[in-house]
Interface confidence: low
């Protein structure tokens, strides 16, 4: 039985410094008392505490873990929020800039072909969006569709334009010959590999950050287990029950203490690393044709090329289907199916050449050097957290869980510990399930990352990276080719800048599926400025 | 298979909200944009707007801007639609329609809002 | 008040064919897809026809659907009495930034 307290001693500090925590006092002893029923703060000798007072102390103690983990992982959460909205909107902008050069091409090469070709383009182009949105949808459907679309335009327009209108239920049948006659070549096939390789990684590596915000807002979000919750009271609250007011926990001790209460999300620090790399590797291996922004803003020209294509071989094409499709007018092949102005005309598809301007892949480069600085976060956790608390430096003169020691001794704290509660049972627990949930889907991000068919060991090329693969530049390989040879091929380097104001809208653009047969404008295929500006909208 | 389920009917005073609920399931909710469509009793439908459920951004008809407002949960894979300063002609049948570049493929089967005094 | 314009009614016997119009203006179907909806008695909607003439899975090649400039037009052969319904005609308006429907049509089969 401890002594009873001397006469002149009182509770009056820790009665001021609990009233703030919880207003009115009738909780707290006006003197010292046994504390029999204490579960926590076990005392040595009187204590200024009481059982009501410890729940409170718990309550506050875990809530306040909450924050310093939220605090510790604001920084990295925002980084990763900012660059998913950042990203989600510059590939909506290069997806309508490629709409717009594609309806350009088309108003200056083929009047005739539109409006139907804008719908069709419109059409293509919103399927791109909602493809890299995550939407279950086929690539190849996506682009069979666009050039099923465009054949009988271009056959009664172009090819075959004295058709009489009893004629034109040929529709359906031009649709079908399309593809049995390789009318386009293999351009559609080229297309097909070109787009559905750039979205499968570009909708991977959107998915793979909102995973990552995700990862950050479940650990962000964690309730912390009520053992922990003692644990910390323990080191941050009980020497205030014997009235020592201004001691720090040992720093030795909150390290202890911050392992076992974060056992469990320690736990996700082998996947994170995993992530972050296998997203590196996918960042590096998005060029040329595993870059959307490369390819769609290319595809006018394959687009064009294609179409050339038909040209050529149009009086072949025209008998054939003649007999194929039945309609009584037979025409003859002539040189009017040619437009007059057949090539693109470079006003209008100029990009003005900035140097050393920041692209999408410098942007998704530094990303990843940024997330590489958080490689670690998930297992520095503890030691972040106790260095942002307060602690006692050097461990000495500092509180260890249940006096004041000159001295923090990690063998002396654990046997004290013993009969209180037992520190590796804690961490034998294993993760919460949310934490087992968040692991299983990061597992599953990584497969996908990892699995991804993307060539392997990149070659940095200080020209490629500066300035960006250039679509006229073709290798042997047609499927890493961009665009085609000829006259009217325009290079348009990887070079898409930033509006400062990345979240503008166009509302015909932003109407789903049937909005975009809007004639662009000459002056609408501009360049982009000043993406390290940007204020998110998810900030 | 693809279900939305929209809540129940409801019964308003004039110058009350009302809040409609729409959950998806049998597809990508994120992936396809959710419309509201509203029909009064003997008459046509009219569109209100759409939500993207990606994003949450949303495109009101110029009718209803001021008074609509769409959001959605993507953790319940939920779209909800909020009219507010009601009045005796907006009773309804309110449909929640999912999108895509198809038109409205697949409907909810509809929410009756009285408006009554 | 709907801003693509439908007759109201339509009647024919079954076996027969039956046309319903829809017209609009050039910032409407002029410009975009024609899409075409049948609503069954006490029933949500149902997708007919999308992309002016194509028609989704489960619906039967008995509904066929044309455009033709500012107008479009669904058309029903071989009518048959579990096609009375009303039928909207809907497309995007560039001028209202939305979609716009047809007031229906009620199609009987006499």
């Known amino acids: 039985q401890p002594p009873p307290p001397p006469p002149d001693a009182t509770c009056h500090q820790v009665r001021s410094f609990f009233q703030r925590l919880q207003p009115g006092l009738k909780w707290v002893p006006e003197t010292p008392v046994p504390g029999s029923d204490l579960q926590v703060c076990l005392p040595k000798g009187p204590t200024c505490c009481s059982r009501k007072m410890e729940e409170k102390y718990q309550l506050t103690a875990r809530l306040n873990m909450e924050q310093l983990l939220q605090s510790a992982s604001m920084e990295l959460k925002f980084l990763i929020i900012q660059n998913a909205a950042v990203f989600q909107e510059a590939f909506e902008i290069v997806v309508r800039h490629a709409k717009n050069y594609t309806n350009a091409m088309f108003k200056n090469n083929y009047p005739s072909l539109t409006p139907q070709a804008f719908e069709f383009v419109g059409e293509f182009f919103t399927d791109v969006s909602l493809y890299i949105l995550g939407s279950d949808i086929n690539v190849d459907d996506m682009v069979n569709e666009l050039f099923d679309s465009l054949f009988p335009v271009i056959y009664t327009q172009l090819m075959n334009p004295g058709l009489p209108d009893s004629a034109l239920d040929i529709n359906e049948c031009l649709r079908g010959a399309r593809r049995d006659l390789k009318v386009f070549g293999n351009f559609p096939k080229l297309i097909m590999t070109q787009v559905s390789k750039s979205l499968q990684v570009t909708r991977i590596f959107l998915q793979a950050l909102n995973l990552g915000i995700e990862v950050i807002n479940t650990t962000d979000h964690l309730k912390f287990s009520k053992d922990c919750g003692r644990m910390l009271t323990r080191m941050w609250y009980c020497s205030y029950c014997q009235g020592l007011m201004m001691v720090k926990p040992c720093g030795g001790y909150c390290n202890v203490v911050m392992q076992g209460c974060m056992a469990g999300v320690v736990e996700i620090d082998k996947y994170w690393r995993e992530y972050i790399l296998s997203l590196e590797e996918l960042v590096n291996g998005m060029y040329r044709i595993y870059d959307m922004e490369n390819v769609l803003l290319g595809l006018f020209s394959t687009i064009h090329d294609s179409i050339q294509y038909v040209q050529k071989n149009a009086g072949k094409l025209t008998t054939t289907i003649g007999k194929l499709c039945a309609h009584s007018q037979q025409r003859q092949y002539r040189s009017a199916y040619y437009p007059e102005d057949l090539f693109i005309d470079k006003k209008v598809l100029k990009v003005a050449h900035v140097e050393h301007e920041e692209t999408l892949s410098s942007r998704r480069r530094e990303l990843i050097q940024k997330l590489k600085s958080f490689i670690s976060f998930y297992s520095a956790l503890p030691g972040y957290i106790c260095s942002h608390s307060p602690v006692a430096e050097n461990d000495t003169l500092c509180w260890n869980g249940q006096e004041l020691v000159e001295r923090y001794s990690q063998k002396a704290a654990r046997n004290g510990m013993k009969n209180q509660f037992n520190l590796h049972e804690l961490k034998m627990k294993g993760p919460e399930p949310v934490v087992s949930q968040i692991i299983d889907k990061l597992k599953h991000i990584n497969q996908l990352l990892r699995t991804m068919s993307m060539p392997k060991g990149r070659v940095l090329d200080k020209n490629l990276d500066e300035e960006g693969f250039e679509s006229g530049d073709c290798g042997d390989d047609e499927d890493e080719c961009i665009g085609g040879s000829g006259d009217g091929m325009i290079k348009v380097k990887n070079q898409l800048r930033f509006l400062a104001e990345l979240a503008y809208d166009l509302d015909v653009d932003d109407a789903p599926g049937n909005s975009q047969q809007a004639t662009p404008k000459d002056n609408e295929i501009s360049t982009f400025h000043n993406l390290g500006n940007v204020h998110s909208p998810l900030k | 298979q693809v279900q939305l389920v929209q809540s129940g009917a409801e019964v308003k005073k004039p110058g009350a909200s009302v809040k409609v609920s729409c959950k998806a399931s049998?597809?990508?909710?994120?992936?396809?944009?959710m419309h509201w469509v509203r029909q009064a009793p003997g008459q046509g439908l009219e569109w209100m707007g759409w939500i993207n459920p990606n994003s949450g951004g949303t495109n009101y008809a110029q009718k209803f801007q001021g008074r609509v407002t769409m959001t959605r949960d993507t953790s319940i894979s939920t779209a909800y639609m909020e009219l507010s300063r009601l009045r005796s002609d907006d009773t309804a049948v309110y449909y929640c329609?999912?999108?895509?570049?198809?038109?409205?493929?697949?409907w909810g089967q509809g929410t009756l809002v009285t408006v009554s005094s | 008040q709907a801003v693509l314009t439908q007759p109201p009614s339509a009647s024919q016997t079954p076996g027969q064919m039956v046309t319903i119009s829809c017209s609009g203006t050039?910032?409407?179907?002029?410009?975009?897809?024609v899409f075409w909806y049948q609503q069954l008695p006490g029933t949500a909607p149902k997708l007919l026809i999308y992309k002016n003439f194509q028609r989704p899975s489960g619906v039967p090649g008995r509904f066929s659907g044309s455009k033709s400039g500012t107008a479009a037009s669904l058309a029903i052969s071989g009518l048959r009495s579990e096609d009375e319904a009303d039928y909207f005609c809907?497309?995007?308006?560039?001028?209202?930034?939305?979609?716009?429907f047809g007031a229906g049509t009620k199609v009987t089969v006499l």
């Open positions: 809907a497309a995007w308006d560039d001028a209202l930034s939305g979609y716009v």
């Open positions: 329609a999912r999108s895509w570049t198809s038109g409205f493929d697949y």
């Open positions: 049998g597809y990508t909710f994120t992936g396809y944009y």
């Open positions: 050039s910032s409407n179907i002029g410009s975009n897809y």
